[in-house]
């Protein structure tokens, strides 16, 4: 470690080539954790560039990533989950790159799933459900949700709505009636563990009634 | 070796404000989090904030929130952390410490003492 | 905030025999796993020093009579033959939630 240059410019001049970005996947296989990183350049050649991870790791010093055409991939049970870990870019065992990061900030949850929408007539409502891997995890069990949803027409605008349950309630008097609406949710680690949005969930398509129409679930 | 160098002993007024400075050296400084920790005469150990000299991003003990800034200096590997309006249970030794996960502190300053007293 | 709670204040122990410090937090300090407790040792005049984070890892360079159990609430740091140098005073400190907060300390002495 206490071979990098102090300056902060020469320190973010080395990372420029092969700046590379990283997210984690806990308990995303059983109890099996992953690990994926990327070169943030799409045209870095990536002949010969291995990525290797050390430190924070149970039993073993390091672990080799798996590449998968550009993006490169551990899946293990051995990541520690408290300390630092060192991610390298490495080429002919010679590290070009290293990053120091605690794999508890770069968790990403798996995308929400079945989305649904059902309209209820006696209480002029919406009530918006969805499904999501991480209620039965042993770790990332807290997330927060944004549920996004649009009038199709409306190709940018997008409203959200943050929450921490998996069920929500849009009032029928806040949509335009007769209007064909998508919606989709995603989410984010929100107790102790921190990283980035998941993949949004598929979209969900319902068309919302005149204002007089029979209940039941929409049709998609 | 890894190494934080603390600034020398103050000793400062009622309603003053303190700046105490932490030199990191031995590792590049961007990759840790430092923060402060102080400890009253005879007393236990309390966490004050800390901060991330790569973003520059801060986070405070609300008991301090409003007194307590700390900032980094990239160009010299070096954070501060000043605390205002000085009253005499500020009296403490301040310790600058290095995170080596969240958040536990693997390499600790010399400390400063910091005494107020009119 | 969570409150720590450390047993005993001070303890005497011979040379040789095994020293025993708990730690209670007033919620968990655990999810699954992972244990987001630590125990320091500080003498007189220093600083503290890290011995073992997430409740059970020995920090580097540190002798391997320390070590660390317990998860949820109830920690323990267990000294397995204490030495002359094993006198200080011991803290837990936890990390699951801002304030980051330490037990009030033990004074480990030589009976």
């Known amino acids: 470690e206490s071979g990098y240059a102090q300056n902060g410019d020469l320190e973010d001049a080395e990372l420029d080539d092969y700046s590379f970005s990283c997210y984690s996947q806990l308990e995303v296989n059983g109890s099996q954790h992953s690990l994926t990183c990327a070169f943030e350049d799409p045209d870095v050649n990536t002949t010969n560039l291995e990525f290797e991870i050390c430190g924070a790791l149970v039993e073993v010093k390091c672990l080799s990533f798996r590449k998968l055409q550009e993006i490169y991939f551990i899946e293990t049970k051995k990541f520690l989950l408290i300390g630092k870990s060192n991610i390298c870019v490495k080429v002919g065992g010679k590290s070009l790159t290293c990053k120091k990061i605690d794999l508890t900030t770069i968790v990403k949850p798996e995308a929400p799933f079945d989305l649904s929408v059902i309209y209820r007539e006696g209480a002029n409502d919406f009530v918006v459900t969805f499904n999501t891997s991480h209620l039965q995890k042993k770790y990332v069990k807290v997330l927060m949700h944004d549920v996004a949803y649009r009038q199709e027409k409306d190709e940018n605008k997008w409203m959200h709505v943050n929450l921490s349950s998996t069920k929500l309630t849009l009032l029928q008097r806040n949509l335009q009636p007769e209007a064909m609406y998508e919606i989709k949710v995603r989410s984010i680690p929100d107790h102790y563990f921190k990283g980035f949005w998941s993949e949004w969930s598929p979209s969900y398509y319902f068309r919302t009634p005149e204002i007089n129409n029979s209940p039941g679930e929409m049709d998609p | 070796q890894v190494q934080l160098v603390q600034s020398g002993a103050e000793v400062k007024k009622p309603g003053a404000s303190v700046k105490v400075s932490c030199k990191a050296s031995?590792?590049?400084?961007?990759?840790?989090?430092l923060h402060w920790v102080r400890q009253a005469p005879g007393q236990g150990l309390e966490w004050m904030g800390g901060i991330d000299p790569k973003t520059g991003g801060t986070a405070y003990n609300q008991k301090f929130k409003g007194r307590v800034t700390m900032t980094s200096d990239r160009s010299t590997s070096t954070v501060y952390m000043e605390l205002s309006s000085l009253r005499s249970e500020d009296t403490a030794v301040y310790y600058c410490a290095r995170s080596g996960g969240r958040w536990y502190f693997d390499v600790w300053g010399q400390g400063t003492t910091v005494t107020v007293s009119s | 905030d969570i409150v720590m709670t450390q047993s005993p204040d001070s303890l005497a122990v011979s040379l040789g025999e095994r020293a025993t410090i708990n730690c209670r937090t007033s919620?968990?300090?655990?999810?699954?796993?992972?244990?987001?407790m630590h125990w320091y040792q500080q003498k007189p005049g220093q600083p503290p020093k890290l011995l073992i984070y997430g409740a059970s890892n020995l920090e580097s360079g540190v002798p391997d009579r320390f070590s660390g159990s317990g998860s949820g609430t109830d920690f323990t740091l267990t000294i397995s033959s204490l030495q002359a140098e094993d006198v200080a005073v011991y803290y837990c400190q936890q990390s699951i939630k801002d304030p980051y907060t330490f037990g009030g300390g033990t004074k480990v002495e030589i009976k």
């Open positions: 031995g590792y590049r400084f961007t990759d840790y989090e």
């Open positions: 919620e968990s300090v655990s999810i699954h796993l992972l244990h987001l």
